[in-house]
Interface confidence: medium
Amino acid sequence: RAQLERSLRDVVEKTIQKYGTNPEETAAEESWDYVQFQLRCCGWHYPQDWFQVLILRGNGSEAHRVPCSCYNLSATNDSTILDKVILPQLSRLGHLARSRHSADICAVPAESHIYREGCAQGLQKWLHNN
């Protein structure tokens, strides 16, 4: 089981680091988006894991960004963000649709309405229970 956990982490780390860099290879990304969406978590340790990804990193005053699967709908009151940005993408995740759009990446708002827990613990629990 420990070996399985290590292998899983290796896959996840590679997925995070290569996220969005190849539009032709999105299977691992879609799977990880679905994990974040279902387990209500973001990143491996914490959401900041995503800030190492070049295409997601803001510079200076520009906001950092994360995959929209990190968004916690129950913590977001801004209807504009919900209606125009997040809900369309999460509905794709919910239906496990196989289409990717650049808008799958969302800016982190000031109050960071994203899941604040990493997915590691949830995945490890899941592995132990199965």
């Epitope: 340790h45 800030f51 190492q52 604040r116």
Partner: antibody, heavy 117, light 107 residues
Amino acid sequence: VQLQQSGPELEKPGASVKISCKASGYSFTGYNMNWVKQNNGKSERLEWIGNIDPYYGGTTYNRKFKGKATLTVDKSSSTAYMQLKSLTSEDSAVYYCARSVGPMDYWGQGTSVTVSS
Amino acid sequence: DIQMTQSPASLSASVGETVTITCRTSENVYSYLAWYQQKQGKSPQLLVSFAKTLAEGVPSRFSGSGSGTQFSLKISSLQPEDSGSYFCQHHSDNPWTFGGGTELEIK
């Protein structure tokens, strides 16, 4: 971004001390606040004590400091606190607060704590 | 806990030279490694995050590399203001730990 820490403390063995870290220039609840210990003198090694998520108040401690340090926040004043209890000479050090976005990107100026009878 | 072995403990170099500081971790920390600079009596300052990303405002003569268990910080074209202590730190698993530090003296 600024992290302003409280002033130096001189305490007796067995006492407790609470040091503060006031954040400004960013969204306080959007980042974890960490605390780091740095010994004075020859070995200036840095030790991570733990961190707190100001949004929920959740804490993560280095097990070495569990029971020694207690981390809290006051969201209304954007201030983080660390209380150290049952002080001994081993606790004499400079303590830093540091914001983290993964690594610790902004640090306070440090608070010197001296424990002496 | 993950052990951080940083070397050398101290080094002395002249203005314009290039120096490299290395950091070895006892376990795989992926890219979760940061480098800090600390000047006498001051707080540490972030230089490099996620092993190779230069922090805002850090001169391009600093560069980080490595992943897994082997990392290095290279400072090329040394300047007098580069003197001070340098620390590596992982933020991979609890507890985060730091290297023992490298004291850099500019001759």
